[in-house]
């Protein structure tokens, strides 16, 4: 999906009002020095591409993020503020239902959510390309 035509300000507002707090809750008890951010993004559409990938694509050691509250709210924000996003996600959602697993918070998941927080920071304030 091409995130170029999303309403970035509305997505930012959704993130700051609720999603950010859900991420903090998920990370509670984790030391702030524990993880280095290794995933970066250069502009807002790129940031959303990386955020979508980390939030919804299962990875080795962390298959459960898509069912977390922050993920569901992220999905809702993208569906509302990115034209045509919902349609592109129907097949992906059906595939995800088939592989649903019970929620387990692993260290790998915590690291992934730390990466997400970093990507959202850059989405909220792109360093070189203020949009």
């Amino acid at each position: 999906y091409d995130f170029t035509n999303c309403d970035f300000e509305k997505i930012k507002a959704a993130y700051l009002s609720t999603i950010s707090k859900d991420l903090i809750t998920y990370m509670s008890g984790t030391k702030s020095t524990e993880f280095n951010n290794t995933v970066s993004c250069s502009n807002r559409p790129h940031c959303l591409t990386e955020i979508q990938s980390l939030t919804f694509n299962p990875t080795a050691g962390c298959a459960s993020l898509a069912k977390e509250m922050f993920a569901m709210k992220t999905k809702a924000a993208l569906a509302i503020w990115c034209p045509g996003y919902s349609e592109t996600q129907i097949n992906a959602t059906q595939a995800m239902k088939k592989r649903r697993k019970r929620k387990v918070t692993t260290n790998k998941c915590l690291e992934q959510v730390s990466q997400l927080q970093g990507l959202w920071r850059r989405f909220n304030r792109p360093l070189l390309k203020q949009q």
Epitope: S20, N36, N37, L127
Partner: antibody, heavy 119, light 107 residues
Framework: EVQLVQSGAEVKKPGSSVKVSCKAS????????IEWVRQAPGQGLEWMGV????????NYNENFKGRVTITADKSTSTAYMELSSLRSEDTAVYYC????????????WGQGTTVTVSS | DIVMTQSPDSLAVSLGERATINCKAS??????VTWYQQKPGQSPKLLIY???NHYTGVPDRFSGSGSGTDFTLTISSLQAEDVAVYYC?????????FGQGTKLEIK
């Protein structure tokens, strides 16, 4: 607890340069932007520039006409701000600050470094 | 550059009374406004981010509102420790810019 500790006060001659350091502790240095802000005596706050220590990207206030250079050393968790071609109007307290967890504000500030430019 | 203009420049309010500080941007900054408090001889402290969100540990008597070009910081019941200079800041466009500051004193 995150802390930003800045280098000590400096007295400089007009036309010279000054390099102020800002050492971070208590957080992951490369994960957060570091900003530089200055405050002339009895005046308000002026944003100078920012660096992403993770990748080295920077953005500067063009009002400083290329006189500002911001760098970061990940190995020592230290950011630096160098200001060249100093003039008396550059006499100020220089602060480093770290972006907050949302990327929308500066939540931790250094104690400030006083730079006096005088002949 | 986006100019942030605060009013008034100084303000004297009685203890327990409401204090209101205004900040006007020269062009729309959406909701990208932050408020800082600076006491004499100290570094600035973050109060409110993204117009109305309280930073951790900031008392509820502080609140922010507005959008677009007009923003307000309100202290609902002034306490002695609130004496300080207050700054608004926009981070909507580079360069980031601050208001000139509003000095709050006790009447």
């Amino acid at each position: 607890e995150v802390q930003l500790v800045q280098s000590g006060a400096e007295v400089k001659k007009p036309g010279s340069s000054v390099k102020v350091s800002c050492k971070a502790s208590g957080g992951t240095f490369s994960n957060y932007l570091i900003e530089w802000v200055r405050q002339a005596p009895g005046q308000g706050l002026e944003w100078m520039g920012v660096i992403d220590p993770g990748v080295g990207d920077t953005n500067y206030n063009e009002n400083f006409k290329g006189r500002v250079t911001i760098t970061a050393d990940k190995s020592t968790s230290t950011a630096y701000m160098e200001l060249s071609s100093l003039r008396s109007e550059d006499t100020a307290v220089y602060y480093c600050a770290r972006e907050d967890n949302t990327g929308t504000a500066f939540d931790y500030w250094g104690q400030g470094t006083t730079v006096t430019v005088s002949s | 550059d986006i100019v942030m203009t605060q009013s008034p420049d100084s303000l004297a309010v009685s203890l327990g009374e409401r204090a209101t500080i205004n900040c006007k941007a020269s062009q729309s900054v959406s909701s990208d406004v932050t408020w800082y408090q600076q006491k004499p001889g100290q570094s600035p402290k973050l109060l409110i981010y993204y117009v109305s969100n309280h930073y951790t540990g900031v008392p509820d008597r502080f609140s922010g509102s507005g959008s677009g070009t007009d923003f307000t910081l309100t202290i609902s019941s002034l306490q002695a420790e609130d004496v300080a200079v207050y700054y608004c800041q926009q981070h909507h466009r580079f360069p980031l810019t601050f208001g000139q500051g509003t000095k709050l004193e006790i009447k």
